[in-house]
Interface confidence: medium
């Protein structure tokens, strides 16, 4: 069974998938469509790297541009370094500016919804 066929079989169960499962899927050439990606738990999507999302979505990575204002894409963008987002070639804006240090202060993030940044 190839990656695409496997993805079809598990697609209906993916809404609640944890980050670890999404990371594993990104290595299996599944080409997750955007409709499915948009239904994923925000907290599961946030830790994914730009490279992992690109592998997870395959051709559908190009559609992130259309979803950049919607969750979970919007929140995921806020967590990525702008340099990394730029490598997607989609003009996605709102990432962490170059030279900033990200502090994983979960309480601060829980209150504000955004990571805590220290300037250069």
């Amino acid at each position: 069974m190839n990656g695409s066929e496997y993805f079809v079989k598990i697609q209906s169960f993916l809404g609640g998938a944890p980050t670890e499962d999404l990371k594993a899927l990104s290595q299996q050439n599944v080409s997750m469509d955007l409709a499915t990606f948009m239904k994923l738990r925000t907290d599961a999507v946030l830790p994914l790297t730009v490279a992992e999302v690109q592998k997870l979505l395959g051709p559908h990575v190009e559609g992130l541009k259309a979803e950049e204002r919607h969750r979970p894409v919007r929140d995921w963008i806020l967590r990525q370094r702008q340099d990394d987002l730029d490598t997607l070639g989609l003009g996605l804006q709102g990432g962490i500016p170059n030279g900033y240090l990200v502090l994983d202060l979960s309480m601060q993030e829980a209150l504000s919804g955004t990571p805590c940044l220290l300037g250069p």
Partner: antibody, heavy 120, light 107 residues
Framework: EVQLVQSGAEVKKPGASVKVSCKAS????????MHWVRQAPGQRLEWMGN????????NYNEKFKNRVTITVDKSASTAYMELSSLRSEDTAVYYC?????????????WGQGTLVTVSS | DIVMTQTPLSLSVTPGQPASISCKAS??????IAWYQQKPGQSPQALIY???YRYSGVPDRFSGSGSGTDFTLKISRVEAEDVGVYYC?????????FGGGTKVEIK
């Protein structure tokens, strides 16, 4: 208005290479991947590959992987498709087309096409 | 690779009558399908994306339906300007692939 202007027709000998250009205007060139599709006489459309205009990264159809190179010149908003080791079966019209412009997937905009004739 | 199979190969339709083109994918592609019209000597023109959504400017006589592996393009009332070759395309996974085309002509 989105416009894609391709270079003119080419006649090449078997074994030679050809480089077709595609100048884009009317949208942010680095925000959308550029694809190349060809159509041999009486044949179906055939996807060759694409390029991320921001990073220069590309994906290729395995059928062409060792013969095709897709590049960009960001400063000129131009994409290039070079096909080497030409054979008669490569006689075709070659199109450039960005995918997913705005929020809609698919090839909504196409270049006018470049006819490449391979003949001894 | 995902193989897209179109039927029929050609279609001769009386103006004002409906026309229907089928496209079958060799594996599930969800609704990640687009339809194009190509007139002789011209670049393809996009009609439908995501299986059933019309691009702006496309007449409402064109409609698309289907999901999974079976898709249909319908023209409710064929007009003379609709002659050309129609292609389906999947963008579910690389390599992107097209159907073999259906030629529509007027009786």
């Amino acid at each position: 208005e989105v416009q894609l202007v391709q270079s003119g027709a080419e006649v090449k000998k078997p074994g030679a290479s050809v480089k077709v250009s595609c100048k884009a205007s009317g949208y942010t060139f680095t925000s959308y991947w550029m694809h190349w599709v060809r159509q041999a006489p009486g044949q179906r459309l055939e996807w060759m590959g694409n390029v991320n205009p921001s990073s220069g990264g590309s994906n290729y159809n395995e059928k062409f992987k060792n013969r095709v190179t897709i590049t960009v010149d960001k400063s000129a908003s131009t994409a290039y498709m070079e096909l080497s080791s030409l054979r008669s079966e490569d006689t075709a019209v070659y199109y450039c087309a960005p995918h997913y412009i705005g929020s809609r997937p698919g090839f909504a905009y196409w270049g006018q096409g470049t006819l490449v004739t391979v003949s001894s | 690779d995902i193989v897209m199979t179109q039927t029929p190969l050609s279609l001769s339709v009386t103006p004002g009558q409906p026309a229907s083109i089928s496209c079958k994918a060799s594996q599930n592609v969800g609704t990640n399908i687009a339809w194009y019209q190509q007139k002789p000597g011209q670049s393809p023109q996009a009609l439908i994306y995501s299986a059933s959504y019309r691009y702006s400017g496309v007449p409402d006589r064109f409609s698309g339906s289907g999901s999974g592996t079976d898709f249909t393009l319908k023209i409710s009332r064929v007009e003379a300007e609709d002659v050309g070759v129609y292609y389906c395309q999947q963008y579910n996974s690389y390599p992107l692939t097209f159907g073999g085309g259906t030629k529509v002509e007027i009786k």
